[in-house]
Amino acid sequence: LQDLCSNCPAGTFCDNNRSQICSPCPPNSFSSAGGQRTCDICRQCKGVFKTRKECSSTSNAECDCISGYHCLGAECSMCEQDCKQGQELTKKGCKDCCFGTFNDQKRGICRPWTNCSLDGKSVLVNGTKERDVVCGPSPADLSPGASSATPPAPAREPGHSPQ
């Protein structure tokens, strides 16, 4: 009997009520592997979740977060509210970055400004709540005749949670 069930492909289940016949998964359910005795209920993306990929007979739905929220956890199991740049999300809500720290993302916590002097450089552009300082050449490099190219501000591309 087990051998008959192992022949049932993904998208079907082995129907015990019908002599191990492979029956298609009912609507709003799926089986991603063969030989299943039941189909799993499709995930529903409701509330702060929105559908990224519809459920099919062989794969579950995939959810994303609506605007103003971001995913956390494997398969986006949770949506957490965004903050503004220059803020961090604490357990009590969004809070402005303290002086000397910044956050250029809508998530995460505020990061200390770069200390340019540790690498023998000087501050070219001061930091803000939203942006890190920009380090320039060391003071010794700024003597007359020394060329100095202005480095770009440290932009970050939108990040992703570790999923």
Epitope: I109, C110, A155
Partner: antibody
Framework: QVQLVQSGAEVKKPGASVKVSCKAS????????MHWVRQAPGQGLEWMGW????????NYAQKFQGRVTMTRDTSISTAYMELSRLRSDDTAVYYC?????????????WGQGTLVTVSS | SYVLTQPPSVSVAPGETARITCGGD??????VHWYQKKPDQAPVLVVY???YRPSGIPERISGSNSGNTATLTLSRVEAGDEADYYC????????????FGGGTQLIILG
Amino acid sequence: QVQLVQSGAEVKKPGASVKVSCKASGYTFTGYYMHWVRQAPGQGLEWMGWINPNSGGTNYAQKFQGRVTMTRDTSISTAYMELSRLRSDDTAVYYCAREPGYYGTGLDYWGQGTLVTVSS
Amino acid sequence: SYVLTQPPSVSVAPGETARITCGGDDIGDKRVHWYQKKPDQAPVLVVYEDRYRPSGIPERISGSNSGNTATLTLSRVEAGDEADYYCQVWDSSSDHPGVFGGGTQLIILG
């Protein structure tokens, strides 16, 4: 897929310097901060610092300030960690690890580690 | 700088539940991350931001955090779970932002 591949093991004498490399692939190197963490034999994990590969901005643990320098070469998607004035207690496995897009979360991808042995 | 305190070891029989604690002042106000470290292997992130699992980490691994203690829970432990586990936080207010606990060796009995 994301990969961080580090340079091979090194044996150094006390007082010397070592430079460990970490080549990134499978993602946009300049978009994600890189951290360095070490583990001495029989000891725990110890955070050393980070570098923003886009700007070159760094932050070092106070313990290593003045001895560590983190740099990068964006043209070859490689981060470097140089530790100078080596002592025997710097013998450790050194890891690079990627921060996944924002500060305050866990480090999601790690290099395989580079063993640095400091011995006279 | 901020200090995280872990027990040196935790022993548990296969199939049982292991709980590894990480203590710190008002740690419940911080986001705690957990790494599994096996000999001669790189650390692996198993829980981030107190309770979230990266893809590929089994559901029997979970985390919680409140007050002065964060906890990593491994249910139905297997021989392959034997490893060192480290908690970690970021402390932007200090001169040492990245802080790890001392690590806990999970010993599977039998």
